[in-house]
């Protein structure tokens, strides 16, 4: 037979309800009442003092009409204990000496053998009849994953035998399953919370709390939902689960009031260029409700009016946005505002920032191109375009020509400095075309280049006078 | 999660046999008792006994022995109830169902019908 | 064998109302550990039984708060605060601290 016990209860004759057997009689299996301890069940079957059918090993040998069947002992069928206590139950066996092979017990939890970091004991007990053997298992501190069925399983003259189950039901504290969680409300709007916590043992009573305050009088049945009217502050709210076995409180979670966003903060000009200005800023505190979108406020500093602010919407993230078509070599006061559910912040702190100068706007003018045979060379001269401040100091220009001939395409480049409207460049293909282009360029970039102007090339030493250009069709620039 | 299903509805003679079927799924088939019902229409529950799948020993209702024989193959994860002898008296349906860790049936089949009718 | 009496057979409710079940055995259902193995069920038209309370008073897992379970020794109770809809059908009690198991013989919910 045998039973469970409190941890405490370590002598060996103490796991039975009565004294170790010795030799119990073949084919009997007697049922030991369960000790008073609370913690233990009977089998399902009380009062049952042996099986309907008991699984006889199968024996090959000629004398296997003569070897009584085996089985396990009835034990103690169901245990109920709390979590974190100790337990200890056995599965005993009495084998016949007309048994020859016997392997060791082994203990199953669940359909899987259970090795090494349980505890288990094997004690022997043999007379002129045969041998009594009892596995004892213990459980220090138990878990609810130490719920489980168990038995015993065992060799006999090459039969497995198996016991029936002992189901371990692991009692405990309420177990949260699903605890409040902190959420963001908007101001005297009603908001629910929920906790469920299960044991065993049920039922599981819920106590709400608020700001360290029990909001309900009466316990509710877990799963309870708390519906809250509305809040003016933030507070903090958990759920204490109630079972027989005691109390467990949940996290407590809190409960914030959506308010607007603080202004962001440390706008910066990541880069500048003539027409366009890159700011980044951080942003600042959500107001517990996500940022929707940010406004870039951009008005000229220069201005003695209180010029127009313009006004860039772009999302929240990234927090960078490139300000365009603004003007080049201009001051601007650049601020940010961000949004979330509940309103727009206040503007962050203006900061100062300045587009680059810009390239030209307009191509040189009067641009003349002269053939000088004797030299053979071109003399091109233009005159200065007006340039105006944003577009920059005027640093040099830009001449394109290209030369086309039959069979033959070249294209090249000059730059030359500001000082002077002139050029001279060799010529690079007889009996040709050559058109010529040219640009300002300012520290701002290289602006629009002029209308082409086109100049006949003739075959070498053919003419004996200089001609002049020719502007290409549809200018009417004189020559 | 657990479940268990049974073997569609029978219609056999008097005097026959008739075997059901209850296939678990979702647990350890081999570590907890199944146990058989019967309803008759129209009436209650009737508890008619329990096997235990890792060892096979089984456990009879007085009523139902020599009528119902319990057995399982662990192997498939399925029990069986042979019902022998049968008689208008039989006809019901039947039910297994898993006896859980909290010592309550949990767990039962969608129930079998057998209709005794010659 | 324990024989488990249940009453009333058959009870008329309207939906939102209270319902109160009995079932006594004619033994006590107590262990000598204390503890009872009375467990209630509810088969609905057309299903397999479902466990709603084991052991007099533990709710099983998934079932609606508005089932509970009392009583000890020999009487037992189950209740419902509020009956819904989807409680109809019939409620069985059922004792495995003795064998051969017996249940009760059912009570019908229905609607008034």
């Known amino acids: 037979g045998g039973t469970a016990e409190k941890w405490e209860e370590t002598e060996l004759d103490q796991l039975f309800s009565g004294p170790l057997p010795g030799r119990l009689p073949v084919n009997h299996r007697p049922f030991s009442a369960p000790h008073s301890s609370r913690d233990q069940l009977p089998p399902p079957q009380t009062g049952r003092s042996h099986p309907a059918h008991t699984a006889a090993p199968q024996v090959t040998s000629t004398a296997s009409k003569l070897l009584p069947p085996v089985a396990f002992n009835h034990t103690i069928g169901h245990i109920v204990l709390s979590e974190h206590k100790n337990v200890k139950f056995n599965c005993s066996i009495n084998i016949p000496n007309t048994y020859q092979e016997t392997a060791g017990i082994s203990w199953w939890k669940d359909g899987k053998e259970l090795l090494g970091a349980h505890h288990s004991i094997t004690q022997f007990y043999p007379d002129e009849e045969g041998v009594s053997i009892i596995a004892l298992f213990s459980i220090a501190s138990v878990q609810r994953s130490d719920n489980g069925s168990y038995f015993c399983k065992m060799k006999v003259n090459n039969r497995e035998i198996v016991s029936d189950p002992i189901y371990v039901e692991v009692q405990g504290l309420p177990y949260f399953i699903k605890q409040p969680e902190s959420v963001n409300v908007t101001r005297n709007t009603a908001f629910n919370l929920t906790c469920q916590a299960v044991g065993p043992p049920e039922p599981v009573n819920i106590f709400w709390v608020q700001n360290s305050s029990r909001v309900n009088e009466k316990p509710e049945r877990s799963p309870s939902v708390l519906t809250v009217p509305g809040l003016t502050e933030t507070a903090v709210f958990s759920c204490e689960a109630h079972n027989d076995k005691g109390l467990t409180v949940s996290k407590g979670v809190h409960i914030n009031i959506k308010v607007i966003p603080s202004p962001p903060t440390e706008v910066h000009i990541l880069n500048s260029t003539a027409h366009s200005i890159l700011v980044s800023w951080v942003p600042g505190f959500d107001g517990y409700s996500p940022l929707q979108n940010c406004s870039i406020q951009v008005k000229e500093a220069d201005r003695l009016s209180n010029g127009s602010v313009m006004v860039f919407n772009t999302s929240a993230s990234p927090h960078l946005y490139e300000i365009q078509q603004l003007q080049a070599l201009a001051n601007y006061s650049i601020a940010v505002s961000c949004r979330n559910e509940i309103g727009w912040s206040a503007v962050s702190p203006w900061i100062l920032a300045s587009t680059t100068e810009g390239a030209p706007s307009v191509a040189p003018l009067n641009i003349t191109v002269f053939l000088n045979e004797s030299n053979n060379i071109l003399d091109i001269r233009w005159t200065k375009p007006p340039i105006k401040r944003q577009d920059g100091e005027l640093v040099g220009y830009r001449i394109s020509h290209v030369w086309e001939s039959a069979g033959t395409y070249k294209e090249l480049s000059e730059e030359v400095s500001q000082n002077g409207s002139w050029a001279q460049i060799p010529v690079q293909i007889h009996n040709a075309t050559c058109t010529v282009r040219i640009a300002a360029i300012t520290k701002g970039g290289i602006g629009p280049f002029s209308e082409p102007v086109n100049i006949i090339i003739p075959e070498h030493s053919k003419v004996d006078y200089a001609p002049s250009s020719t502007p290409a069709p549809g200018n009417t620039d004189s020559m | 999660q657990v479940q268990l299903q049974q073997s569609g509805p029978e219609l056999v003679k008097p005097g026959t046999s008739v075997k059901i079927s209850c296939k678990a799924s979702g647990y350890s088939f081999t570590s907890y008792y199944i146990h058989w019902v019967k309803q008759r229409p129209g009436q209650g529950l009737d508890w008619i006994g329990w096997i235990f799948p890792g060892n096979r020993n089984t456990q009879y209702n007085e009523k139902f022995k020599g009528k119902a024989t319990l057995t399982a193959d662990t192997s498939s994860s399925t029990a069986y109830m042979q019902l022998s002898s049968l008689t208008s008296e039989d006809s019901a349906v039947y039910y297994c169902?898993?006896?859980?860790?909290?010592?309550?049936?949990?767990?039962w089949g969608q129930g079998t019908s057998v209709t005794v009718s010659s | 064998d324990a024989v488990m009496t249940q009453t009333p057979l058959s009870l008329p409710v309207s939906l939102g109302d209270q319902a109160s079940i009995s079932c006594r055995s004619s033994q006590s259902l107590e262990n000598s550990n204390g503890h009872t193995y009375l467990h209630w069920y509810l088969q609905k038209p057309g299903q397999s039984p479902q466990l709603l309370i084991y052991?007099?008073?533990n709710r099983f897992s998934g079932v609606q708060d508005r089932f509970s379970g009392s009583g000890s020794g020999t009487d037992f109770t189950l209740k419902i605060s509020r009956v819904e809809a989807e409680d109809l059908g019939v409620y069985f009690c059922l004792q495995v601290t003795h064998v051969p198991f017996t249940f009760g013989s059912g009570t019908k919910l229905e609607i008034k």
């Open positions: 052991r007099v008073s």
């Open positions: 169902a898993r006896l859980g860790l909290i010592y309550a049936l949990d767990y």
